[in-house]
Interface confidence: low
């Protein structure tokens, strides 16, 4: 028995579900009595569902899988994974036995997409050109790690005096803050771009200082 | 079995309001994104934004932001999009449809048919 | 935004051919690409996403293939109910562009 599987890894939104894709081509007069399929995680072996003695053995993974019973007949091994958060992430191996076997493994990116980020100012008030200020850009709840760019008014980088910290909440979602120091011209925009990797997703926040007022 | 049914539409004028619903059912509203998709008579596809329920993820097309609004209510398995400022461009078949992986949309509404005129 | 030209943008062809349609990026995307077909006065139908995945009950005979920048959908012998119009998709930076689409006519 072949079996088939995605060689590209499968993207999927947290909170959403993703179906981690496996086939076999079953022989002539095959039955589902003769199936042996397991799905477990690559790495730890650890046993994620499985189909064995003719029946769906069910989940051994949070409760979270499913098979597609009516399509096993087909061929179709491909698993359910409900609801996906960030520790769903990894290898899963596909294990299907007839009366010989093979296994094939499929990955699973986890993904989430970063909020518009949010811009404040310190000070933020009597302002002169000349002036050393901080700019925080804040962006909440993404996966995985962003990358973050700061930019002048004409779109050229700004790589100097910037910090950013990346905190994972309980959920593995990653708050992004970070803090550009500068030292202000006569008027400027300064933007902040926070990239999400995977999703090829860009969230742009900006500032203005036109002396007073500022807008965001 | 998975369903989605839009309406609200209707004949409105430019600068008018509308608001759309998507109505869910046969599956779990509360963790799936939903999308509206437009298409102009005679037109391809466009797309017009997406929400996670939950509402904290949004995300529209320049050609709708500032005037579209998306919106979700888990406790009804509804999805909405509130449309101000209308104009007539914005005529066009108005259609939801779920998030099944990166890059896909599984399940779609019959659609409902948005037309802005004077 | 990343723009998805679509070509041809209509095509004659006969029950058994084989068809090809391809959309190009106009920049550099993710493998997040789906293509849909849809019949007059009906909403689309999904049939590959992530570029190449057939999805759940659309017949073996649709494909999709990915090179670089280029992305292509194949019906491998054309059948009565596969003249329509198809579409394709991306969703690079959460934001969605479909092509103009590709009417398929019987010769």
């Known amino acids: 028995v072949e079996v088939q599987v995605s060689e590209d890894p499968v993207v999927a939104l947290v909170d959403t579900d993703a179906t981690l894709r496996c086939s076999f081509s079953p022989e002539p007069g095959f039955s589902l009595r003769q199936l042996n399929l397991i799905w477990q995680l690559t790495d730890t072996k650890q046993l994620v569902h499985s189909f064995t003695e003719g029946r769906d053995q069910g989940s051994a993974y949070a409760n979270r899988t499913a098979l597609f019973p009516d399509l096993l007949v087909q061929g179709n091994a491909s698993l359910r994974l409900q609801r996906v958060r960030v520790t769903d992430e990894g290898s899963y191996t596909c294990f299907v036995s007839i009366q010989d076997f093979d296994s094939a493994a499929v990955s699973l990116q986890v993904a989430a997409p970063y909020s518009k980020p949010s811009m404040t100012l310190e000070p933020n008030k009597d302002l002169r050109p000349g002036d050393m200020v901080t700019i925080t850009c804040s962006s909440y709840q993404g996966y995985p790690e962003a990358e973050v760019f700061w930019k002048d008014g004409q779109g050229l980088p700004l790589t100097g005096n910037v910090t950013t910290s990346q905190m994972a909440n309980e959920r593995g979602l990653f708050d992004v803050h970070s803090v550009l120091r500068v030292v202000l011209g006569a008027n400027g925009t300064y933007s902040c771009l926070v990239r999400n990797p995977v999703l090829q997703q860009d969230a742009h926040g900006s500032v203005t200082i036109t002396g007073q007022p500022m807008t965001f | 079995e998975v369903q989605l049914v839009e309406s609200g539409g209707g004949l409105v004028q430019p600068g008018g309001s509308l608001r759309l619903s998507c109505a869910a059912s046969?599956?779990?509203?509360?963790?799936?994104?939903i999308h509206w998709v437009r298409q102009a008579p005679g037109k391809g596809l466009e797309w017009v934004a997406w929400?996670?329920?939950?509402?904290?993820?949004?995300y529209y097309a320049d050609s709708v932001k500032g005037r579209f609004t998306i919106s979700a209510d888990t406790s009804k398995n509804t999805a909405y999009l509130q449309m101000n400022s209308l104009r007539a461009e914005d005529t066009a078949v108005y259609y939801c449809?779920?998030?099944?992986?990166?890059?896909?949309?599984?399940?779609w509404g019959q659609g409902t048919l948005v037309t802005v005129s004077s | 935004d990343i723009q998805m030209t679509q070509s041809p943008s209509s095509l004659s062809a006969s029950v058994g051919d084989r068809v090809t349609i391809t959309c190009r990026a106009s920049?550099?995307?993710?493998?997040?690409v789906a293509w849909y077909q849809q019949k007059p006065g009906k909403a689309p139908k999904l049939l590959i996403y992530?570029?190449?995945s057939l999805y759940s009950g659309v017949p073996s005979r649709f494909s999709g293939s990915r090179s670089g920048t280029d992305f292509t959908l194949t019906i491998s012998s054309l059948q009565p109910e596969d003249f329509a119009t198809y579409y394709c998709?991306?969703?690079?930076?959460?934001?969605?562009?479909f092509g103009q689409g590709t009417k398929v006519e019987i010769k």
């Open positions: 449809a779920r998030h099944y992986q990166v890059g896909a949309m599984d399940y």
């Open positions: 046969g599956f779990t509203f509360s963790t799936y994104y």
């Open positions: 929400i996670h329920p939950s509402g904290k993820y949004t």
């Open positions: 920049q550099s995307v993710s493998s997040a």
């Open positions: 998709q991306q969703s690079g930076r959460s934001l969605y562009t």
């Open positions: 992530s570029a190449s």
